[in-house]
């Protein structure tokens, strides 16, 4: 799969492949994988991809199921790249405070916060 | 500050304190703090709180600015708790796939994805 495929298209295709291969992926009934308790997904990317690794190691490869796992590894690569961009640019306190304000604002409106 | 204050109220109060103390917080003009380039904030919580630590170490403490940093440390505590919940529960492949589908669906609709 060329890495040039836009990430948004990659995600869409992966969702479709996930539905297609569901039966094969749940075949191992003894398998236990960590599942986050909350819906703040971005906080859990590490665990999600560890789970994908566990699933891949237990799934019979071949055909488009291989494409599914290849896609998922490209999505991981994209997310790792985004994580790198968290700390690459060192800016003044002024810009940091604007970003912090945005972060807290997003927490306030979009995060799923339990009381 | 009692930890019992709901996190949502804590975030609101912190936003207000941030505005109040802005001038004091930007006083050190030589300070450089990592600022993420993108808006996928949850991926960057580690760097954001490292930045807050840098800012705190360079800010003259006293009065309500102390309350600001106390609040921020409680928010960090909340997020750390959320991160712990990413891997505590081990479920069947079926549940994991439901969560993965939800994660990709959120990525598809809510994440800020550059082409």
């Amino acid at each position: 799969i060329p890495t040039e495929i836009p990430t948004s298209a990659l995600v869409k295709e992966t969702l479709a492949l996930l539905s297609t291969h569901r039966t094969l992926l749940i075949a191992n009934e003894t398998l236990r994988i960590p599942v986050p308790v909350h819906k703040n997904h971005q906080l859990c990317t590490e665990e999600i991809f560890q789970g994908i690794g566990t699933l891949e190691s237990q799934t019979v490869q071949g055909g488009t199921v291989e494409r599914l796992f290849k896609n998922l590894s490209l999505i991981k690569k994209y997310i790792d790249g985004q994580k790198k961009k968290c700390g690459e640019e060192r800016r003044r306190a002024n810009q940091f405070l604007d970003y912090l304000q945005e972060f807290l604002g997003v927490m306030n409106t979009e995060w799923i916060i339990e009381s | 500050i009692p930890t019992e204050i709901p996190t949502s109220a804590l975030v609101k109060e912190t936003l207000a304190l941030l505005s109040t103390h802005r001038t004091l917080l930007i006083a050190n003009e030589t300070l450089r703090i990592p600022v993420p380039v993108h808006k996928n904030h949850q991926l960057c919580t580690e760097e954001i709180f490292q930045g807050i630590g840098t800012l705190e170490s360079q800010t003259v403490q006293g009065g309500t600015v102390e309350r600001l940093f106390k609040n921020l440390s409680l928010i960090k505590k909340y997020i750390d708790g959320q991160k712990k919940k990413c891997g505590e529960e081990r479920r069947r492949a079926n549940q994991f796939l439901d969560y993965l589908q939800e994660f990709l669906g959120v990525m598809n609709t809510e994440w800020i994805i550059e082409s």
Partner: antibody, heavy 119, light 107 residues
Framework: QVQLVQSGAEVKKPGASVKVSCKAS????????INWVRQAPGQGLEWIGY????????RYNQKFKGRATLTVDKSTSTAYMELSSLRSEDTAVYYC????????????WGQGTLVTVSS | DIQMTQSPSSLSASVGDRVTITCKAS??????LSWIQQKPGKAPKTLIH???RLIDGVPSRFSGSGSGQDFTLTISSLQPEDFATYYC?????????FGQGTKVEIK
């Protein structure tokens, strides 16, 4: 493709206000800050401020604080710059420009809007 | 505010010449500087960001260098379409500030 299209030229009397629009297309509007820059005839460029469409937060050059107001309409992916108490020295071409990332370089510019202040 | 001093304010050059424009910041701006080209009656266009990173689609004859306070824009071999005014912009701190511009004219 990514585009910023600005409203047409305006002629205003001293003391009046002007509101310039900047319609974004080809990208997710809330992902990038919008900056406003002006250029008086034969002069250089001057930064007015920026607005973050993600949270409506704006920051101004002190020189324009109190006179310039930056707003956005997310439903139409449009940014606005309103300048009040106009004087003849506000005659300029006003540009909107998109930040590539947070507090980053301006990767896309609008075509400019000429505002003439004359009695 | 951070002052950006650009020099020269204008220069005359011929096609094929190597042209250098400098920009000096009144304080350390790290590498948060971009170079902008503007042709008469047109909107500005960013050529280089973060002091030395060429923007996609910009010809490789343009290059930038420097960090801290001193920065340079170089056009290795001037082309007819390069006759324009060039500005430096610091986006290190608010308010963002521009140099006063360098007009590159045909000799």
């Amino acid at each position: 493709q990514v585009q910023l299209v600005q409203s047409g030229a305006e002629v205003k009397k001293p003391g009046a206000s002007v509101k310039v629009s900047c319609k974004a297309s080809g990208y997710t509007f809330t992902n990038h800050h919008i900056n406003w820059v002006r250029q008086a005839p034969g002069q250089g460029l001057e930064w007015i401020g920026y607005i973050n469409p993600y949270n409506d937060y704006s920051r101004y050059n002190q020189k324009f604080k109190g006179r310039a107001t930056l707003t956005v309409d997310k439903s139409t992916s449009t940014a606005y710059m309103e300048l009040s108490s106009l004087r003849s020295e506000d005659t300029a071409v006003y540009y909107c420009a998109r930040d590539y990332g947070n507090f980053w370089y301006f990767d896309v510019w609008g075509q400019g809007t000429l505002v003439t202040v004359s009695s | 505010d951070i002052q950006m001093t650009q020099s020269p304010s204008s220069l005359s050059a011929s096609v094929g010449d190597r042209v250098t424009i400098t920009c000096k910041a009144s304080q350390d701006i790290n590498s948060y500087l971009s170079w902008i080209q503007q042709k008469p009656g047109k909107a500005p266009k960013t050529l280089i960001h973060r002091a030395d990173r060429l923007i996609d689609g910009v010809p490789s004859r343009f290059s930038g260098s420097g960090s801290g306070q001193d920065f340079t824009l170089t056009i290795s071999s001037l082309q007819p379409e390069d006759f324009a005014t060039y500005y430096c912009l610091q986006y290190d701190d608010f308010p963002y500030t521009f140099g006063q511009g360098t007009k590159v004219e045909i000799k």
